[in-house]
């Protein structure tokens, strides 16, 4: 922390302005009232601070508000927002989208992963829902950021933003993400054809259930490989031979080459030996021919 | 080592058709699938489509739906692709190529379409 | 369908020298939950079939000498052969295995001074 000295009557300061490059830490901190460089906290970004100086500024306005800083602050944070923990952010009320662009330009190219997601956190819970407007400041100036919300939080989406979503946007989504996000999609392309159905639908069938997937294959789709790899393994695995190859269509050759990834490997595992051999691929590691397959959970709820 | 042997010509007039042939040799025939290819001079390389010859399917590429017509026979390693209502368009070399990334290829059919 | 674009079309080097052809893809070919990408590099030397050099973008096919060498992922590609030889002389095919129908570039002649 910063030693408390008394501010030299040359030295004080009436506006935030270029001068105070020049002035040393302690001298900032005596002499650059809190108030005054909350009220002028716009013009602080144009100025060429350095990193300890913004130290400085940061430890005047953690003390003038302890419970977090208010909105018009925060706007105009700059560069001030790379000083900034999740642990401050978290103690903000953001309800602005040009905030959140704002601070989103600031931290590109920076490693703020952590605090980007816990301001998006902020900003819907200051909206009080993760609306349309929300979901196009975020895809346009964060992609991939979506996927750093909590389900809890995606569950505030409503399925008629879903079609502002791109599959870029979901790239780092995690399961239970997908399983917020598959039903409310879901319910938004309901209307649609078939092929177009699938078209929008594939980005969230990382959160598809087993009775979903089982329907697809029924409706020529040619699932890509790397999307059948992102469905739940318990959405695969109770899958036939006959339903991952409809579902796959020329794609199934790929199995050969993941063969040792799941979803693949352990879907493998359960196929009879002569079924896989109708695939073609030389696949092997299934149930041999004659093997009868006891299923011990069944007995053991019964009992 | 492993081969995928194909003839040299084939000379046909247009309206006719033709069946090329791929014989396999020196691996499992029944554990890769066979893919064929067209390569007309100066223009690249098109995938007409595929076939499983553990159970037949077949898949083609739309552009060649109506025009290529891809078989096997197990029992002698060799697949076929039947080309009809031909044009001086279907003029080409065509090649067999096997597996997920294409890692032998056959030593490719010129067919040439002239009255 | 997926387009794959080559460049340069077609390039002329001396033996010894490094040559370096690029491939972009429409879509990412990248399989995130294998991390493959689904791209093959192949040689067609004059009058001869097509063969392949690398598949996966970077894994090498056996028998194929180690100055050839694949790099990229999900949509910009690279070849590389670090010190060409005459035996080169060739075209280089990039082809995408993601998703049907299967698709290739329009290929980069190398010729060798």
């Known amino acids: 922390d910063v030693e408390r000295t008394t501010c030299p009557p040359e030295k004080e300061v009436h506006e935030i302005d270029e001068s105070l490059i020049f002035y040393k830490k302690r001298e900032l901190e005596a002499c650059v009232d809190a108030a005054l460089l909350a009220a002028q906290m716009d013009r602080v970004d144009a100025i060429p601070f350095t990193y300890e100086q913004l130290d400085v500024l940061k430890h005047k306005l953690d003390e003038l508000y302890p419970q977090g800083y208010p909105e018009s602050v925060i706007r105009h944070l700059g560069h001030l927002f790379l000083k900034m923990s999740p642990e401050d952010i978290r103690k903000w009320n953001v309800t602005s989208l040009e905030t959140l662009k704002a601070l989103l330009k600031v931290s590109k190219g920076h490693e703020m992963s952590a605090q980007v997601a816990t301001l998006i956190d902020r900003v819907v819970v200051g909206r009080g829902q993760l609306d349309k407007d929300t979901v196009d400041t975020l895809t346009a100036f964060c992609p991939g950021c979506l996927c750093s919300l909590s389900p809890e939080r995606l569950s505030s989406v409503p399925p008629s933003v879903i079609g502002a979503v791109r599959p870029q946007d979901l790239d780092t989504c995690g399961p239970r993400q997908l399983d917020v996000l598959y039903p409310k999609a879901r319910l938004a392309f309901q209307n649609m054809s078939g092929s177009e159905y699938f078209v929008k639908i594939r980005p969230f069938l990382g959160g598809a259930p087993t009775e979903d997937v089982k329907a697809l294959s029924q409706q020529n789709v040619s699932m890509d490989l790397a999307t059948f790899m992102k469905l739940r393994r318990e959405a695969v695995l109770p899958l036939t031979v006959a339903e991952v190859q409809k579902l796959l269509g020329p794609h199934v050759e790929g199995l050969k080459v993941e063969e040792q990834h799941s979803p693949v490997r352990d879907w493998i595992l359960k196929q009879r030996q002569d079924d896989l051999d109708t695939l073609g691929l030389g696949l092997q590691g299934g149930i041999p021919n004659g093997y009868l397959i006891l299923d011990l959970s069944v007995r053991e709820a019964l009992s | 080592q492993v081969q995928l042997q194909q003839p040299g010509t084939e000379l046909v007039k247009p309206g006719a058709s033709v069946k090329l042939s791929c014989k396999a040799s020196?691996?499992?025939?029944?554990?890769?699938?066979m893919h064929w290819v067209k390569q007309r001079p100066g223009q690249g390389l098109e995938w007409i489509g595929s076939?499983?010859?553990?159970?037949?399917?077949?898949y083609y590429n739309e552009k060649f739906k109506n025009k290529a017509t891809l078989t096997v026979d197990k029992s002698s390693s060799t697949a076929y692709m039947q080309l009809s209502s031909l044009t001086s368009d279907d003029s080409a070399v065509y090649y067999c190529a096997r597996g997920w990334y294409f890692d032998v290829w056959g030593t490719g059919t010129t067919v040439t379409v002239s009255s | 369908d997926i387009v794959m674009t080559q460049s340069p079309s077609s390039l002329t080097v001396s033996v010894g020298q490094k040559v370096t052809m690029s491939c972009k893809s429409s879509q990412s070919l990248l399989n995130s939950s294998s991390q493959k990408n689904y791209l093959a590099w192949y040689q067609q030397k004059p009058g001869q079939s097509p063969k392949l050099l690398v598949y996966f973008a970077s894994t090498r096919e056996s028998g194929v000498p180690d100055r050839f060498i694949g790099s990229g992922s999900g949509t910009d590609f690279t070849l590389i052969i670090s010190s060409v030889q005459a035996e080169d002389l060739a075209d280089y095919f990039c082809q995408q295995h993601y998703s049907t129908p299967r698709t290739f570039g329009g290929g980069t002649k190398l010729e060798i001074i």
């Open positions: 020196d691996y499992t025939f029944t554990s890769y699938w």
């Open positions: 076939i499983n010859p553990s159970n037949g399917d077949t």
